[in-house]
Amino acid sequence: KKEDGESTAPTARPKVLRCKCHHHCPEDSVNNICSTDGYCFTMIEEDDSGTPVVTSGCLGLEGSDFQCRDTPIPHQRRSIECCTERNECNKDLHPTLPPLKDRDFVDGPIHHK
């Protein structure tokens, strides 16, 4: 819980952060490096065929608190990790897919023809 009077808005970094980007490189990235006022991230998720896909890149300060919180999404296996401690810190992030729930075997993409 936030203390009274404490801002819920994330604090702006005094300087730009460079991150590795893969499958998630914006137009202003160069040599698979993007820049941000927020966080670097690495994410793993299943595509439509159930294959794990890893993406990485930059998250802007706006909304990044929510995006980095890794809130579970029904019927979607996904995990995200964020960092800010140094440039390209997301090279060292290795999120893993959450374990399959029993329900996922029934409802999951495996059974879609």
Epitope: V16, D28, D37, G38, G60, R86
Partner: antibody, heavy 116, light 112 residues
């Protein structure tokens, strides 16, 4: 107040190398990037590259890769730019500049003269 | 590389006049974070550049309010409402959205 102190001038011979210094004060050195910019008379300003003193991460303008090497000494809050294989084309004023998301403070510049 | 085209190259003015300098970039300067990293600097004779305006329209500390920056995307303008003697020098536009960062070729503000 923020200050970036550079030597006023360097005179060097063609083919040699030079290491230009930039001593920062008035702020936390590791909280900002340090950039280096070249200015030749009538040629405008050219971005050489930048270094993050907190982790020594560097980014270079492709044009200056192999020419410039950026380093820092955090214990003395000093940034360095080494220029190698000097020619008359490297004669210019070189500025260090503090960078967060834009350059807000510049050093006074070091005039490099390459001459035999 | 992003090319920054500044006009005019030379701007003769009388003290007290309004001055206007334009800068156009070869591609949009809107960063993926939504910020536009476009800035204006003034280099007075024999000195290093100094920051006037950052992120299109924000005056840096100590910069008089006669300096106004505006624009978006690829087209930007610096207006000086009443030119004073201390405003003379070369004005540079700059972008830090795309690596390598680039500068305009400069506009020399001089007395008519």
């Amino acid at each position: 107040q923020v200050q970036l102190l550079q030597p006023g001038a360097e005179l060097v011979k063609p083919g040699s190398s030079v290491k230009v210094s930039c001593k920062a004060s008035g702020y936390t050195f590791t909280n900002y990037w340090m950039q280096w910019v070249k200015q030749r008379p009538g040629q405008g300003l050219e971005w050489i590259g930048e270094i993050d003193p907190s982790d020594t991460y560097t980014l270079y303008n492709q044009k200056f890769k192999g020419k410039a090497t950026l380093t820092v000494d955090t214990s003395s809050s000093t940034a360095y730019m080494q220029l190698s294989s000097l020619t008359s084309e490297d004669s210019a004023v070189y500025y260090c500049a503090r960078f967060g998301y834009y350059v807000d403070y510049w050093g006074q510049g070091t005039t490099l003269t390459v001459s035999s | 590389d992003v090319v920054m085209t500044q006009t005019p190259l030379s701007l003769p003015v009388s003290l007290g006049d309004q001055a206007s300098i334009s800068c156009r970039s070869s591609q949009s300067l809107v960063h993926s974070t939504g910020n536009t990293y476009f800035h204006w600097y003034l280099q007075k004779p024999g000195q290093s550049p100094e920051l006037l305006i950052y992120k299109v329209s924000n005056r840096f500390s100590g910069v008089p309010d006669r300096f106004r920056g505006s624009g978006s995307g690829t087209d930007f303008t610096l207006k000086i409402s009443r030119v004073e003697a201390e405003d003379l020098g070369v004005y540079f536009c700059s972008q830090s959205t795309h690596v390598p960062f680039t500068f305009g070729s400069g506009t020399k503000l001089e007395i008519k």
